[in-house]
Interface confidence: medium
């Protein structure tokens, strides 16, 4: 015998005190797949939350952060404070990032410069707090006579937090 | 307790500067950010811009050309800078810190007036 | 940027009653919606943040409620000292912006 709740589409829920018939999702509660048995509570973005995405019937509210936080742990599960460029968020607060790692954005933690060296490159542009060192073409193709210059190296991506 | 105080010169000559000291106690300017905000009979509260914890700013965009705003951890006080000051600028000058739980303002100084007129 | 309307300038009242203060934002700023008391002479005083939470130590007679573009602040057995003007702000986004206030004034 077929489930007769399997019939329930998403955005309803198969509702026992009603002989099984499909009833909607009530108000601030979703379902996103069929044949389920009750509807799970909206989530709401209070606080230092703001909504993203609104909650359906179908699907479950998105949160991002208020202005001055940026989210972190899947689906946005905290929010921190925004540190500035060159800095990173460590338990003392915001602190500038150490001598030879830098971090590009206002979240995430402080990466080590690109090392030009090891790829047998030179230093075209030093790193900083805030931007990765750029590595030119290695010194062999500095000799007289070489023509052809390597592009830079395209600068590492500092750690995300995950959206 | 918290406690935010403004100090600033209480007149200013149009076309010159204003400069406002917000010393905090109570908490750490570590762990918490700090707003700016003007009152004025003719337009009511402005937010004019915020610091947070690892010096960020934030401005509002109507005032960015001409606001700055920083802060000595150490001291425990946020600097208020705002250029070629006009009559409309006439106002009462808060801050008031940000909490960690969103983007308001928990705690205020008690204001600072400026007038700007020659 | 968001305008925050209180269309009520002065609302009247007595000790005892209970009165809700409107707000309404330019645009959805979902529950980012702040409320401010202020006294004369006095610097605002935090009550409300987003739309129902109250700040620690304000006394459970106001509530806050509303999400989207409308968001009612409701002082229910008025107090003298709650005579005061009621601010909004919304942080659902830069710049932050206020409401104009209304003041809550004795019949």
């Known amino acids: 015998l077929q489930d007769p709740c399997s019939n329930c589409p998403a955005g309803t829920f198969c509702d026992n005190n009603r002989n099984q018939i499909c009833s909607p999702c009530p108000p601030n509660s979703f379902s996103s797949a069929g044949g389920q048995r009750t509807c799970d509570i909206c989530r709401q973005c209070k606080g230092v939350f703001r909504t993203r995405k609104e909650c359906s019937s179908t699907s479950n509210a998105e949160c991002d952060c208020t202005p001055g936080f940026h989210c972190l742990g899947a689906g946005c599960s905290m929010c921190e404070q925004d540190c500035k460029q060159g800095q990173e968020l460590t338990k003392q607060g915001c602190k500038d990032c150490r001598f030879g790692t830098f971090n590009d954005q206002k979240r995430g933690i402080c990466q080590p410069w690109t090392n030009c060296s090891l790829d047998g490159k030179s230093v075209l542009v030093n790193g900083t707090k805030e931007s990765d060192a750029v590595c030119g073409p290695s010194p062999a193709d500095l000799s007289p006579g070489a023509s052809s210059v390597t592009p830079p190296a395209p600068a590492r991506e500092p750690g995300h937090s995950p959206q | 307790q918290v406690q935010l105080q403004e100090s600033g010169p209480g007149l200013v000559q149009p076309t010159q500067s204003l400069s406002i000291t917000c010393t905090v106690s109570?908490?750490?300017?570590?762990?918490?950010?700090v707003h700016w905000v003007r009152q004025s009979p003719g337009k009511g509260l402005e937010w004019l811009g915020v610091?947070?914890?690892?010096?960020?700013?934030d401005y509002n965009a109507a005032f960015i050309s001409r606001l700055s705003i920083s802060k000595d951890n150490s001291k425990s006080q946020v600097f208020f800078k705002m250029n070629s000051l006009q009559a409309d600028d006439t106002a009462i000058y808060y801050c008031?810190?940000?909490?960690?739980?969103?983007?308001?303002?928990?705690?205020w100084g008690q204001g600072t007036s400026v007038t700007v007129s020659s | 940027d968001i305008v925050m309307t209180q269309s009520q300038k002065f609302m009247s009242t007595s000790v005892g009653d209970r009165v809700s203060v409107t707000c309404k934002a330019s645009?959805?700023?979902?529950?980012?919606v702040a409320w401010y008391q202020q006294k004369p002479g006095q610097s605002p005083k935090a009550l409300i943040y987003?739309?129902?939470y109250r700040d620690s130590g304000v006394p459970d007679r106001f509530t806050g409620s509303g999400s989207g573009t409308d968001f009612t602040l409701t002082i229910s057995n008025v107090q003298s000292e709650d005579l005061a003007e009621y601010l909004c702000?919304?942080?659902?986004?830069?710049?932050?912006?206020f409401g104009a206030g209304t003041k809550l004034e004795l019949k």
């Open positions: 008031a810190r940000n909490p960690l739980t969103a983007t308001v303002m928990d705690y």
């Open positions: 109570g908490f750490s300017l570590i762990s918490y950010g």
């Open positions: 610091i947070w914890s690892g010096g960020s700013t």
């Open positions: 645009q959805n700023v979902g529950t980012n």
């Open positions: 987003s739309a129902s």
């Open positions: 702000q919304q942080y659902n986004s830069y710049p932050l912006t």
